[in-house]
């Protein structure tokens, strides 16, 4: 229940990739505005996105303070031009979000193959260690810094001349694989967090092939 000219937000949804985290909701406002609050289970509420007509709020700055905490957000609805007005129970109408634990739930962004280098019959494939917005000691941490050995990469590789794929895994950002001399290979990688039950895998990286600019060849 609430005032006759405000409706409660609904379909509150967390959209999070590599810890960049946005809360989205419906409906598009008609004669109303929204304010968002976020809190950890044991913490105080902090207000964000004051009196906005948007239906999303970037909460990254809050969740990166401790990505292993569980967060709850709520979206308050106010009549436009009369934000002091409250619902029938004497407080603004609001709706709670689902709980969100960034470390366990943020989607893994599409990885990128940074480089590959062939030395004889070995190829070293390096995955770009993407920077996140998580900070420690005033430094932005990489995905590997945050997840450590919890994060692995799966490499798919195949001869340019055939369709048969092979795979390898690493819990660093580098693969060292055996190849046939004189053959060109293509590569794609996928990030995985084996211990998770949801949002476990990223999409595959763009395919990179030998004979193109990212690679180096040495005898």
């Amino acid at each position: 229940s609430g005032t006759t000219n405000t409706v409660a937000a609904y379909n509150l949804t967390w959209k999070s990739t590599n810890f960049k985290t946005i809360l989205e909701w419906e409906p598009k406002p008609v004669n109303q505005v929204y304010t968002v609050q976020i809190s950890t289970k044991s913490g105080d509420w902090k207000s964000k996105c004051f009196y906005t007509t948007d239906t999303e709020c970037d909460l990254t700055d809050e969740i990166v303070k401790d990505v292993k905490q569980t967060y709850l957000a709520r979206v308050f609805s106010y009549p436009a031009g009369n934000v002091e007005s409250t619902g029938s129970a004497g407080e603004p109408l609001y709706e709670n979000s689902p709980e969100f634990t960034p470390y366990l739930e943020t989607n893994l962004g599409q990885p990128t193959i940074q480089s590959f280098e062939q030395v004889g019959t070995k190829v070293n494939v390096t995955v770009e260690d993407e920077r996140t917005l998580v900070r420690r000691n005033n430094t932005f941490l990489s995905l590997r810094d945050v997840f450590g050995k919890d994060l692995i990469y799966t490499l798919y590789y195949w001869k340019s001349s055939s369709s048969g794929k092979k795979t390898a895994k690493t819990n660093t950002n580098e693969f060292l694989i055996d190849v046939d001399k004189g053959e060109n290979y293509c590569f794609s990688v996928q990030a995985v967090i084996p211990s998770r039950t949801v949002n476990r895998k990223s999409t595959d990286s763009p395919v990179e092939c030998m004979g193109q600019e990212k690679g180096e060849f040495r005898e």
Epitope: Y156, K165, K166, A168, K169, P194, S195, V198, R200, K201
Partner: antibody, heavy 117, light 107 residues
């Protein structure tokens, strides 16, 4: 509860084909890798191949690459193993297994394939 | 391809004995090794992963050690329900390969 149930095994003549199914419940196969492993009577375990059901990527032991095809239908939450040009030495119990990328944590009960004339 | 050499192929032991099974990889597989127990007519069951981590519900008498190329599964005090066949699996690169298996029998 996580469960994998294989079906489709049976008696087939040499040169014949068979399609095995692995029906998953209690999780979405697209979130995991799915493998097929076989075991000939009285012998050890032999890895056949895997699929990432989300993108269709498949990897095989090269010895099976030409005759076996792994596929998946995420709407049915089921993985498949299509086996062609079957030989007597393909007689085995075929298992499907779920892979977290760190280990195979759940296995089906297996389905017996017998290749004989 | 990576070969996994498992030994012994079989062993006889008594309840309460300490049992050690080894797996040797033909080249470095880092931590991508897991151990499985299989009883007759049943599917394999995960015991140990990342060479040292316990699977859910696995008794602490089972332990894993090693890295690189040499790995060991130890059963500190064999129990009646432990008589089974044990397999190692390398899943660091394809084709994934199992050891030949070790059958643990009652002495």
């Amino acid at each position: 509860e996580v469960q994998l149930v294989e079906s489709g095994g049976g008696l087939v003549q040499p040169g014949g084909s068979l399609r095995l199914s692995c029906a998953a419940s209690g999780f979405n196969i697209k979130d995991y890798y799915m493998h097929w492993v076989r075991q000939a009577p009285g012998k050890g375990l032999e890895w056949v191949g895997w699929i990432d059901p989300e993108n269709g990527n498949t990897i095989y032991d090269p010895k099976f690459q030409d005759r076996f095809t792994i596929s998946a239908d995420t709407s049915k939450n089921t993985a498949y193993l299509q086996m062609n040009s079957l030989r007597a030495e393909d007689t085995a119990v075929y298992y499907c297994a779920r892979d977290t990328a760190a280990y195979f944590d759940y296995w089906g009960q297996g389905t017996l394939v017998t290749v004989s004339s | 391809d990576i070969q996994m050499t498992q030994s012994p192929s079989s062993l006889s032991a008594s309840v309460g004995d300490r049992v050690t099974i080894t797996c040797k990889a033909s080249r470095d597989i880092k931590s991508y090794l897991s151990w499985y127990q299989q009883k007759p007519g049943k599917a394999p069951k995960l015991l140990i992963y990342y060479e040292t981590g316990w699977a859910e519900g696995v008794p602490s008498r089972f332990s894993g050690s090693g890295s690189g190329t040499d790995f060991t599964l130890t059963i500190s005090s064999l129990q009646p329900e432990d008589f089974a066949t044990y397999y190692c699996l390398q899943h660091g690169e394809s084709p994934f390969t199992f050891g030949q298996g070790t059958k643990v029998e009652i002495k």
